[in-house]
């Protein structure tokens, strides 16, 4: 069975094809080449040498137990190289000669032993190793690290290291890899040497599931004193063995770090008291709760100095009680109780993410809600009712605005985005929003994107909503039930780019309403049901017009339609996906495409 | 199309086919078996992935009696710090697991469950399998 | 399941008028756009009239133009078809169609009702 050509001369996948050597029909100029789930079992000398450009190689799965020396010694460009999963018994020497641009090797459950005896000094281009899910027992970096100066990210998790001693890590002491991230978790770590990490500065050490009891995550966390790291995850994950014992001894050791940002992901244990719990995290940059249940929520007002919260997936009784002066963004989302918005404190605020809460606001916008003038990005997408009983006031610094997905109420009742001048982006698709008021955008003079799709119009008619967008590029009105428009509807927009009208309802297809649209580029009028057109004679597009979407449409193919069936075949630069303009009618037409259609009146006369 | 036995217990019987062509090969154990008027347990699971379990997701689509029920998206990795450790699992590495699970107060009307279990991984997406769940519900049996 | 059911065809002199009715059950297709094709004998089946669900919308094949009308009421799940001035080449079975609540065109067929016209 051939491999399969994804891109012409350049991607091959050959997954599990039963293959036990290389190919050879494939070409010189092959750059990813996918050989996984094949028995190959061994790998001689050069047994890439018809490969010269390759730069992606998985060999995930092929039961490759011997790799010899110089086995990808013609791969001079290749930048990833992919093992995953082959029982490796026998790796020579200079089994990775030759490979001199590599950037990413993976070796997970390889049966790989011991990082000394790893071959992989001279690969002085590479940024990630990943070697988890093997059988290293020691933590010692070897001597050969000081090689690997661009290393960005190293992978030991789902070992079996259980002690870090400090002559471990002393090859960083050599040369400090400032960016370097690593993961440890799912080690059984007992013990961590005071002094281990003594003036090592990382970007970012995660470590889940390495304690089995709160002893040992405490003096382990002791022993990371001096480190000074850009981020730091702890935690644990929901399908391994969790601690039955958590409280606020177990992260006084962070106390001695140097810590930026701050993670805590999964934890099996409700959180009480945080305040006293992340004493020594007060004054990181970022503080971040993914996935743990936390029962006391006024204690978000204590005066911690995050810049930046993030409550993800997690779990509370009510909506926390947020007073932080310093915090600048908090990212709240998909988490769970406390259905009811409450106002927050946060003075700094400028980016602020509420979305997938299912939350349901009482009345919505303005500055009271949230405590702050400063906003520029607010998310309130996927939540539940919100009602809009205020026009945004004192928070006329809003760039971006999102309520996708949300059920907003009293949109037609007053111009809710009056103060909004600054606004760039606005999304309020799917929100069952029913426009019956011409002043609904008035005041977003600095719109650039609006979407509005899977909403409804008065009359399914499309009113002059758009007269004060005038540096709008982008607009999708698509799945809205329309069936008419106003023939000014898009008069004012010069700047429109990208024109979704598609999934409603049209009949016929007229150009007269985008006569205006100097600077339109895409119109997609896909998924209506246009049969004809609604004048005999139609006019140009505007030249600027590059792309026109008339696809799964309802042509009808008759005589009487010839004019407006050649100006389609006329219009056929500017056309895609040709092959799905299907004529609906008559019968013997249907499912003709449009485009191949000999259109002299010899039909159906 | 052959069908696998996962288990009975006391008010169900619990099976699954393939719904995808390449049928690669996953172990299910249930250790209780489900029993639908409430249960807890553990699933084990045994598989090795032909793609990264990055962005994992469920589209679980359920019938009842021969009534179809709305697709339900159920998203296991977010493709970040996610809860399950799985989620980190690339293409060709075993997948050997065990994922506790609980439930209670819900009650299922006898009769023919089916569920089709279509997982969703990786960038861009793909259907990394598919599974259909047959669970048969007798309430009142012993 | 949708079913269309059509009445209202006949037999009628040239000149003459005719109202066909289409009832839908199974489920309401008040949102939907519904139609109306027709088959001459020895002619392919061709679209007549065709109405969206709000009523806004018509469409109305050239030969009909100014003589046929096309009219729902969604209250009855019901469209119809207001023929006057009819031809003898109007003579044809008159199907009535229904657009899916998703949106597929032409989705569901009524069985057809015969309408002729004799000169």
């Known amino acids: 069975e051939p491999c399969v050509e994804v891109v012409p001369n350049i991607t091959y996948q050959c997954m599990e094809l039963n293959f036990y050597k290389i190919p050879d029909n494939l070409p010189f100029s092959t750059k990813n080449l996918d050989l996984s789930f094949n028995p190959l079992r061994h790998l001689g000398s050069y047994s890439f040498f018809s490969f010269p450009e390759l730069q992606v190689l998985d060999l995930s799965r092929c039961e490759i137990q011997t790799i010899e020396d110089g086995a990808y010694q013609s791969l001079s460009h290749l930048s990833t190289l992919i093992l995953t999963g082959n029982p490796i018994q026998s790796l020579a020497l200079g089994a990775f000669s030759g490979l001199s641009s590599l950037q990413k090797l993976v070796a997970v459950e390889t049966n790989l032993a011991s990082l000394e005896n790893f071959p992989i000094g001279h690969l002085k281009t590479l940024k990630e190793l990943n070697v988890a899910h093997n059988l290293i027992q020691s933590f010692k970096l070897p001597e050969y690290f000081s090689n690997l100066t661009n290393l960005e990210h190293l992978d030991l998790s789902s070992n079996k290291i259980q002690s870090i001693y400090c002559t471990d890590l002393r090859v960083l002491h050599q040369m400090p890899l400032l960016n370097l991230s690593l993961d440890l978790s799912l080690n059984p770590m007992n013990f961590i040497q005071p002094g281990a990490f003594k003036e090592i500065r990382l970007h970012k050490l995660t470590l889940r599931n390495n304690f089995d009891s709160l002893n040992v995550m405490k003096t382990c966390i002791q022993g990371l004193a001096g480190l000074e790291v850009h981020r730091l995850v702890l935690g644990e994950f929901r399908n391994e063995g969790n601690l039955e014992k958590f409280d606020k001894s177990a992260l006084e050791g962070l106390c001695n770090l140097t810590i930026e940002e701050f993670r805590l992901a999964y934890l099996d244990y409700y959180l009480d008291d945080i305040i006293d719990l992340f004493n020594c995290l007060t004054n990181v940059s970022s503080f971040s709760l993914v996935s743990v249940t936390i029962e006391r929520v006024k204690d978000f007002s204590y005066n911690f100095g995050w810049q930046h919260l993030e409550l993800v997936n997690c779990k509370f009784g009510q909506f926390p009680t947020l007073k932080l002066k310093s915090l600048k963004r908090l990212t709240f989302t998909s988490n769970k109780g406390g259905n009811a918005f409450s106002e927050v404190d946060l003075p700094s605020l400028e980016f602020l993410d509420l979305s997938r809460n299912g939350l349901s606001f009482k009345g919505c916008c303005s500055q009271s809600d949230f405590g702050t003038t400063s906003l520029k990005y607010l998310d309130l997408s996927f939540n539940g009712v919100i009602t809009m009983s205020s026009n945004f006031l004192g928070l006329e610094q809003l760039e971006h605005l999102d309520f996708q997905h949300s059920n907003l109420k009293q949109m037609s009742e007053f111009s809710v985005f009056l103060s909004l001048r600054n606004l760039i982006y606005l999304d309020i698709s799917h929100t069952h929003t029913r426009v019956a008021f011409n002043g609904i955008f008035n005041g977003l003079s600095s719109l650039e994107v609006l979407k509005m799709a899977g909403n409804s119009f008065q009359e399914n008619f499309l009113p002059d909503i758009f007269t004060e967008l005038r540096n709008l590029t982008f607009l999708d009105l698509s799945q809205c039930q329309l069936e008419q428009l106003s023939p000014t509807a898009f008069n004012s927009l010069s700047s429109l780019q990208v024109l979704n009208m598609s999934h409603n309802n049209f009949f016929s297809l007229d150009t007269f309403p985008y006569k205006c649209l100097n600077s339109l580029q895409v119109l997609d009028y896909s998924l209506n049901h246009i049969m004809t057109s609604k004048k005999q004679e139609l006019q140009h597009f505007p030249s600027s017009l590059a792309f026109l979407n008339l696809t799964q449409n309802d042509f009808a193919c008759t005589c009487e339609h010839q004019s407006f069936l050649q100006w389609i075949k006329d219009q056929r630069q500017l056309l895609v996906e040709v092959e799905r303009m299907e004529c609906a009618t008559p019968s013997d037409k249907q499912g003709m495409p449009v485009l191949s259609l000999n259109i002299t009146c010899q039909m159906n006369k | 199309q052959k069908q696998y036995w996962v288990c009975n217990s006391s008010d169900a019987s619990i099976s699954y086919t393939y719904c995808d062509k390449m049928q690669y090969p996953i172990s299910i154990n249930v250790n209780p078996c489900i029993e639908l008027k409430r249960s807890k347990g553990l699933l084990h699971i045994f598989y090795i992935p032909r793609r990264d379990l990055k962005q994992l997701y469920f589209n679980l689509y359920i019938t009842v009696n021969t009534m179809n029920l709305p697709k339900r998206k159920e998203v296991i990795c977010r493709g970040s710090d996610d809860d399950y450790s799985f989620c980190r699992a690339l293409k060709g590495e075993t997948v050997n697991t065990t994922i506790s699970f609980s439930f209670k107060g819900i009650k299922f009307s006898k009769g023919k469950y089916k569920c089709v279990v279509e997982a969703i991984s990786g960038s861009p997406e793909e259907m990394l399998f598919c599974l259909e769940f047959v669970i048969l519900h007798q309430p009142n049996s012993n | 399941e949708v079913q269309l059911v059509e009445s209202g065809g006949g037999l009628v002199q040239a000149g003459g008028s005719l109202r066909l009715s289409c009832v839908a059950s199974g489920r309401s297709l008040s949102t939907v756009n519904m139609g109306w094709f027709r088959q001459a004998p020895g002619k392919e089946r061709d679209i007549v009239a065709r109405?969206?669900?709000?009523?806004?919308?018509?469409y109305y094949a050239e030969s009909v133009r100014g003589r046929f009308t096309i009219s729902r009421d969604n209250a009855k799940n019901t469209v119809y078809l207001q023929m006057n001035s009819l031809r003898p080449e109007d003579t044809a079975v008159y199907y009535c169609?229904?657009?899916?609540?998703?949106?597929?065109?032409?989705?569901?067929w009524g069985q057809g009702t015969q309408v002729t016209v004799s000169s």
């Open positions: 169609v229904a657009d899916s609540p998703g949106g597929r065109s032409y989705e569901f």
């Open positions: 109405i969206s669900g709000s009523s806004i919308s018509t």
